[in-house]
Structure formats: C-alpha cells, structure tokens
Amino acid sequence: EVEKTACPSGKKAREIDESLIFYKKWELEACVDAALLATQMDRVNAIPFTYEQLDVLKHKLDELYPQGYPESVIQHLGYLFLKMSPEDIRKWNVTSLETLKALLEVNKGHEMSPQVATLIDRFVKGRGQLDKDTLDTLTAFYPGYLCSLSPEELSSVPPSSIWAVRPQDLDTCDPRQLDVLYPKARLAFQNMNGSEYFVKIQSFLGGAPTEDLKALSQQNVSMDLATFMKLRTDAVLPLTVAEVQKLLGPHVEGLKAEERHRPVRDWILRQRQDDLDTLGLGLQG
C-alpha cells in the first residue's frame, strides 16, 4: 500500500511516457491520474517500468475500478496482466477474442498459470460455449487445453468446434474425455467421404464403441498401431481376430510388439488360440 502524498510541483503526469520510469513509487501514486492511465494503457507496455512501479499502476487501476476493469482497459494490460490475481480476474467481463489473444500473448511460452486459467474460464462462461474461434485460439497457445477440461465442460463444445482440433490437441486426453468428444467428431465429419473421414476421425477413435470399429474393419481403413493402442479396451475386446486383421490391414504385424500392452494383451487373452494362429505372429493367448 502506497501512502497518499501530494504530487511535487511540476511533476504531474500529462501523459504516460518514458519520463515516468524515473518516478519513485510514491511519486507515481501521487502524480499519475488513474483515468489518464486507463485511457493510455496501451503505452505502458512500451515503457520499461520496474515490477514495483507496475504494482503502483495496478493499485491505481484497482482504486478507479473496484468492481473490475472495463474491457477497454483489460485489452491493453499487457505485462500488467502478470500482476493480476485470479480474484482480480474473476471481476472481469471479457467478451472479445482479441482481448483474450492479447492477454494470452503476454503469457506465451509459460505454463498455464492460475490467472490464465481463470481468464479462460471467465471468457468461455461469458460466451456460453467453446466455439470454434475460441478453441482455435486456446489450442494454438496451449495444445493440451482441450484435455485439461472435464467431460462435463467438454459437453458444451459444439460439434462445429471440432474442426479446430488437431491430433496433438488430443494427446493427453483420457478415455472419459474422448467418450464425450467422439460423438461430436462423428457429427462434425459425417458428410466427408471415405478416406478423408477416416483421417479426421482417427484422433477421436479412443471414444469409439465396438460397433463403429466393426464397421470400420470392413472398409479397408488400415488403422495404424498407435491409433489401435488408444482404443477403449472394452470396445476392442469383442472384436474377432478376423475383424482386427481387417481393421489393421498391413499394420497387423505390429500386434506382436504390443502383445504385453493394453488393449492388445487383454484382447489376445479373449481369443481362441486357433484363431490367433491364423495371424502367423506367434501370439499366445
């Protein structure tokens, strides 16, 4: 907390500029008008203020906007955003994607901080759903973002947003999350033809039921082992040896290298040895 002191003669700031870096903390408090700061926030980032000086500027904004900053100020916070607490951010109403991008840019290259998580939460809740443009933005900054959401939160993702999802965005998703995302992907990609559809749906197949895998097995999709290993164990177990052979096509030989890992291990134990022998891979049930 900075003490209230009168501004020395001739030091009253008429604009936010580089001369302010030479002001002591108490001088900034006394000589910079909060309303001026709010209207010229975009200049703050170009000035090499110390962290202590930024604390003073934040304090001035907090006094001016006790109920939370307006979006016109939030959009230009720049590095001052790093000074905000989750409690501060919970007071904000951020509706512009440009504002979100500007603040994410400040935190770029770092792990998702509690501040960023709160900001995203406020933004998504304000929009009511995770639309395509938002998802595009969030996954560009944080590829693991989608998989950080709970199945309940994922249920608010409209199928149209699935077009923004890249395979790497799903790398850390668990089966419960893919169970929610898979039907959305099916809906999103349903009008695509054959090979294009399979390329798009492949990353989501960890949420596919047995019936879908059976259908795909008859259509020359040649699923790779990496995809097969991510399938739900309960969806793979009912597949016959012939169905798995058709599903994997030329990649079926890869089963040998994965025979000790799920879901291959559990699937092997379910099969008759005679059927496994038809693969000629030496798999032991």
């Epitope: 099916r186 009008n191 054959g194 559809y197 259908a215 795909l216 259509q219």
Partner: nanobody, 128 residues
Framework: QVQLAESGGGSVQAGGSLRLSCAAS????????MGWFRQAPGKEREGVGS????????NYSESVRGRFTISLDNAKKTLNLQMNSLKPEDTAMYYC?????????????????????WGQGTQVTVSS
C-alpha cells in the same frame, strides 16, 4: 449406440400392401446406412434393401425391386418399408438394421454381415 424397433407387420392377401416402420433411437449420422432384411422359416436371413442416410441413396435386392420402396423420415428418425404387390414368398420375419459408419455409400448394400445394429423383427404373412 442405436436402438431399433420395428412395427407394422401383419397378415395380408397376395397382391395387397403393408407399410413397415422402424423407429431409431440414439444418434443418426449422415454416413450411416439403414436397411431391411428378412428371414423366412428354415432359410438364411437375406437383404431386402438399404438406404444411405446422407443423400437417400437406395439399394434393393432383385426379388423386391419395383415392388418395395425404402424411405427415411429423418425428423422422426423412422425408416419405412412400403411393400406393394405382395406375394406368398414375401412371408418372413422382417428386420431393420443399421451400419454405424459407411465410408462409401456402396458399403450400404443390404449384406447381412455388414450390419451391426439389429431390431427384434416384425412378422409379415402373405396368404394366397
């Protein structure tokens, strides 16, 4: 998951008509197929006809072409089979079935082994 329930079966005189319906619950996607199959006593189950949901592409077996018509009411999630000029040899248990994903519409042909979801069936009896 898709659940299928047939209705509309019954007894009819040769030359008469019947309309079978199949109510689907669960998600229906454009790249799904739905089909009608039948099984007469002591015979193998055989295809009657099928429809590719996206675009309504239909496919009929030789024995019913020109007499039977398949249609889909997407809003009601109902598959219909309009059967005209019925013959005694059309007597069978009629089943509705679905393929969850068809990467090409040609895959929708009414081939029993391709269909993974099945209804319980409805009996059709045609007497001479």
């Amino acid at each position: 998951q898709v659940q299928l329930a047939e209705s509309g079966g019954g007894s009819v005189q040769a030359g008469g008509s019947l309309r079978l319906s199949c109510a689907a619950s669960g998600n229906l996607y454009n790249n799904m197929c739905m089909g009608w199959f039948r099984q007469a006593p002591g015979k193998e189950r055989e295809g009657v006809g099928s429809i590719y949901i996206g675009g309504g592409y239909t496919n009929y077996s030789e024995s019913v072409r020109g007499r039977f018509t398949i249609s889909l009411d997407n809003a009601k999630k109902t598959l219909n089979l309009q059967m005209n000029s019925l013959k005694p040899e059309d007597t069978a248990m009629y089943y509705c079935a679905a393929i969850p994903i068809a990467l090409t519409r040609a895959f929708c042909a009414p081939i029993v082994s391709r269909y993974t979801y099945w209804g319980q069936g409805t009996q059709v009896t045609v007497s001479s």
